[in-house]
């Protein structure tokens, strides 16, 4: 990995197994402030392969809610408007970091946590299993 | 929003501020133990709107490596393996949570930061304007 | 925001060749598929050619189709359109764009969110 050299006003760390506990501001910057708005709002439904999106909601995560994709078919949806079963509709996954309330309820003290989500769906070829 | 119960064990916090600065556990728990590490390993290449995954590294941002997806093709593969430019590939994003080191080059101090991701693309039915 | 820059138009002699630039600052330029447009005197903006975010793939005008090229470098933040076999009526303002919307085709002007200030080509027959 890449060496950082280290900055002389960074706050202490007591631990032995630093940095396991790290100290994290929960104000959020957000990098996306010229991103389009509209940028995929309506993707889900104009797909060949759409997707619903559900709600889940965890009030000892944060975020307490992500959204979940679920392809609404297993074929794609072909040029006349009709499930073409030759192709596959799949939900494209991601791991994401999340922060898990530790002990449970505390409202200051998280573990890091990977989660895997479903974030849209897209349309693909199946893989063919010829049966000799 | 839910009120959680507050756990006695819980850390003290003396920030009034509370809780914009926490403790966070960096051994991460991963809850996909039992996913398939190939889940979705080749849909880059056998989807319609097929697309490239590129490596973004920085080392003062926790995860330091993140894969940003870039699609291949400003149309979708038809049947016959041709881009077909009635149709268009979009990429699809969200918005993840990060670690950003602050103040810089500090082990074991951070802020949460939003980012927006491209994860991979879909095949969209592209909106047709009509001019008067 | 994101800044395009374009530069290498000057006047060319019919059956020329020219390669404009474009050089994009500010946000992450490989986000984005790029695009370049003309503009003749009295004439409506009109698509010229596009690229893929990944670079792999271009479509181009008809008018255009075998004569320019469209590349991009991400290392160096830049698109070009290599122009061969010049004609006097390609002369016109050429603009670059990117495109962060995708609510429409690759063509159609309105998805193109951000724009250079253009560069002057000129085909003397």
């Known amino acids: 990995g890449i060496t950082i050299p280290r900055n002389p006003g960074c706050p202490n760390s007591e631990d032995k197994n630093f940095p396991r506990t790290v100290m994290v501001n929960l104000n959020i910057h957000n990098r996306n402030t010229n991103t389009n708005p509209k940028r995929s709002s309506d993707y889900y439904n104009r797909s060949t392969s759409p997707w619903n999106l559900h709600r889940n909601e965890d009030p000892e995560r944060y975020p307490s809610v992500i959204w979940e994709a679920k392809c609404r078919h297993l074929g794609c949806i072909n040029a006349d408007g009709n499930v073409d079963y030759h192709m596959n509709s799949v939900p494209i996954q991601q791991e994401i970091l999340v922060l898990r309330r530790e002990p449970p309820h505390c409202p200051n003290s998280f573990r890091l946590e990977k989660i895997l989500v479903s974030v849209g769906c897209t349309c693909v070829t199946p893989i063919v299993h010829h049966v000799a | 929003g839910i009120t959680i119960p507050r756990n006695p064990g819980c850390p003290n916090s003396e920030d009034k501020n509370f809780p914009r600065t926490v403790m966070v556990n960096l051994n991460i728990h991963n809850r996909n133990t039992n996913t398939n590490p190939k889940r979705s390993s080749d849909y880059y290449n056998r989807s319609t709107s097929p697309w490239n995954l590129h490596r973004n590294e920085d080392p003062e941002r926790y995860p330091s490596v993140i894969w940003e997806a870039k699609c291949r093709h400003l149309g979708c593969i038809n049947a016959d393996g041709n881009v077909d430019y009635h149709m268009n590939s979009v990429p699809i994003q969200q918005e993840i949570l990060v670690l950003r080191r602050e103040p810089p080059h500090c082990p074991n101090s951070f802020r949460l930061e939003k980012i927006l991701v491209s994860v991979g693309c879909t095949c969209v039915t592209p909106i047709v304007h009509h001019v008067a | 925001e994101v800044q395009l820059v374009e530069s290498g138009g000057r006047l060319v002699q019919a059956g020329g060749s020219l390669r404009l630039s474009c050089a994009a600052s500010?946000?992450?330029?490989?986000?984005?598929?790029m695009g370049w447009f003309r503009q003749a005197p009295g004439k409506e903006r009109e698509f010229v050619a596009a690229?893929?975010?990944?670079?792999?793939?271009?479509a181009y005008a008809d008018f255009v189709r075998g004569r320019f090229t469209i590349s991009r470098d991400d290392a160096r933040n830049t698109v070009y359109l290599h122009m061969t076999s010049l004609k006097p009526e390609d002369t016109a303002v050429y603009y670059c764009?990117?495109?962060?919307?995708?609510?429409?085709?690759?063509?159609?002007?309105?998805?193109?969110?951000?724009w250079g200030q253009g560069t002057q080509v000129t085909v003397s027959s």
């Open positions: 764009a990117a495109r962060t919307s995708y609510d429409g085709t690759y063509d159609y002007i309105d998805d193109y969110s951000y």
């Open positions: 500010g946000r992450t330029f490989t986000s984005y598929p």
């Open positions: 690229i893929s975010m990944s670079g792999d793939d271009a």
